[in-house]
């Protein structure tokens, strides 16, 4: 039975030309984390494995940093990064944990974060 | 079988600067972070900054910041941390430690510092 | 940043004790919370990952629990050879930071 939860970052905004870290946490479980996939709709952007260490995306690599700790960074914004990014914690013996984030990057200076939410 | 081997003790004057290294070897130098930590004799652990080498990022402890300058070599699988204006509060053990999203789970044998006049 | 506050500061025990070791957050790390492990002239060594994951090679004495601010590192029947220094770190955000430590020593 899957008793774990995801916390994400939830609904952020971040200004044009910034960066913003994406971050997923996973709880109440006691499960072993092997890899955490970030992907953009359907884009794998990067993989963090536990043996492996990262692996970033060839067509990310100088816009995305790993971390911090199972996070990603995402750097020199557009507004085509506005969409829906996932995080896939992969878990044994738990199996498959989805979490999704939703960033909208605005032409303004205004731009505030948006609440933390759970997704079971 | 992963290794981080570090340079030798050091020695240095006050004002001098010193640069270490952390070569790597037994995993894939690009894929993990390189960070560096400092121990005071007797004392704790306090995290200086750390270098991805797969794109060159870096992020460090704002109290380091124009103290310490981190580097990294893909092509020698090594990492270089460059302190300045050393004075005796810079006399210290300095790791390095690789972290690839799950804790630092390796660390060089530590480089000591010693700065004397 | 994130303050790390380790209690207590040292600890002495007799071997075949149970021990319990601190670590309090200044704000919500959620899980992202790490301990270490450092015997006397040696580099320090990941114990547990993630506030509760265990570790390939670690004893299975040594557990983890905690969320949010408060966590603990619990050792089962202290042996002689886990005397030392043991230090928490967060991972939450940057900059990384340690707890100041608890030294674990023979009474």
């Known amino acids: 039975m899957m008793t774990g939860t995801i916390e994400t970052t939830g609904n952020i905004s971040a200004e044009k030309g910034g960066s913003i870290i994406l971050q997923c946490h996973l709880s109440s479980t006691t499960a072993q984390v092997t890899q955490v996939n970030w992907e953009q709709q359907d884009q794998l952007l990067a993989i963090c494995n536990a043996d492996l260490g990262w692996h970033i995306s060839p067509s990310f690599k100088d816009r995305v940093a790993p971390g911090p700790g199972l996070g990603l960074t995402l750097q020199s914004l557009t507004v085509n990064d506005t969409g829906e990014y996932f995080c896939i914690y992969h878990t044994y013996p738990d199996g498959t944990y989805t979490g999704r984030i939703f960033l909208e990057v605005l032409e303004s200076s205004v731009a505030e974060h948006g609440a933390r939410f759970q997704i079971p | 079988e992963v290794q981080l081997q570090q340079s030798g003790t050091v020695l240095a004057r006050p004002g001098a600067s010193v640069k270490m290294s952390c070569k790597a070897s037994?995993?894939?130098?690009?894929?993990?972070?390189m960070h560096w930590v400092k121990q005071r004799p007797g004392q704790g652990l306090e995290w200086i900054g750390a270098?991805?080498?797969?794109?060159?990022?870096?992020r460090y402890n704002q109290k380091f910041m124009g103290k310490a300058k981190l580097t990294a070599v893909t092509s020698a699988s090594t990492a270089y941390m460059e302190i300045s204006s050393l004075t005796n509060e810079d006399s210290s053990v300095y790791y390095c430690?690789?972290?690839?999203?799950?804790?630092?789970?390796?660390w060089g044998q530590g480089t000591s510092v010693t700065v004397s006049s | 940043d994130i303050v790390l506050t380790q209690s207590p500061a040292t600890l002495s025990v007799t071997p075949g004790d149970s021990v319990s070791l601190s670590c309090r957050a200044s704000q919500s790390i959620t899980n992202n919370l790490h301990w270490y492990q450092q015997k006397s002239h040696e580099s320090p060594r990941l114990l547990i990952k993630y506030a509760s994951q265990s570790i390939s090679g670690i004893p299975s004495r040594f557990s983890g629990s905690g969320s949010g601010t408060d966590f603990t590192l619990s050792i089962n029947s202290v042996e002689t050879e886990d005397f030392g220094l043991y230090f928490c770190?967060?991972?939450?955000?940057?900059?990384?930071?340690f707890g100041g430590g608890t030294k674990l020593e023979i009474n």
């Open positions: 430690s690789r972290e690839g999203g799950f804790g630092m789970d390796y």
């Open positions: 037994g995993y894939s130098f690009t894929s993990y972070w």
């Open positions: 770190q967060q991972s939450n955000s940057w900059p990384y930071t």
């Open positions: 270098i991805y080498p797969g794109n060159n990022a870096t």
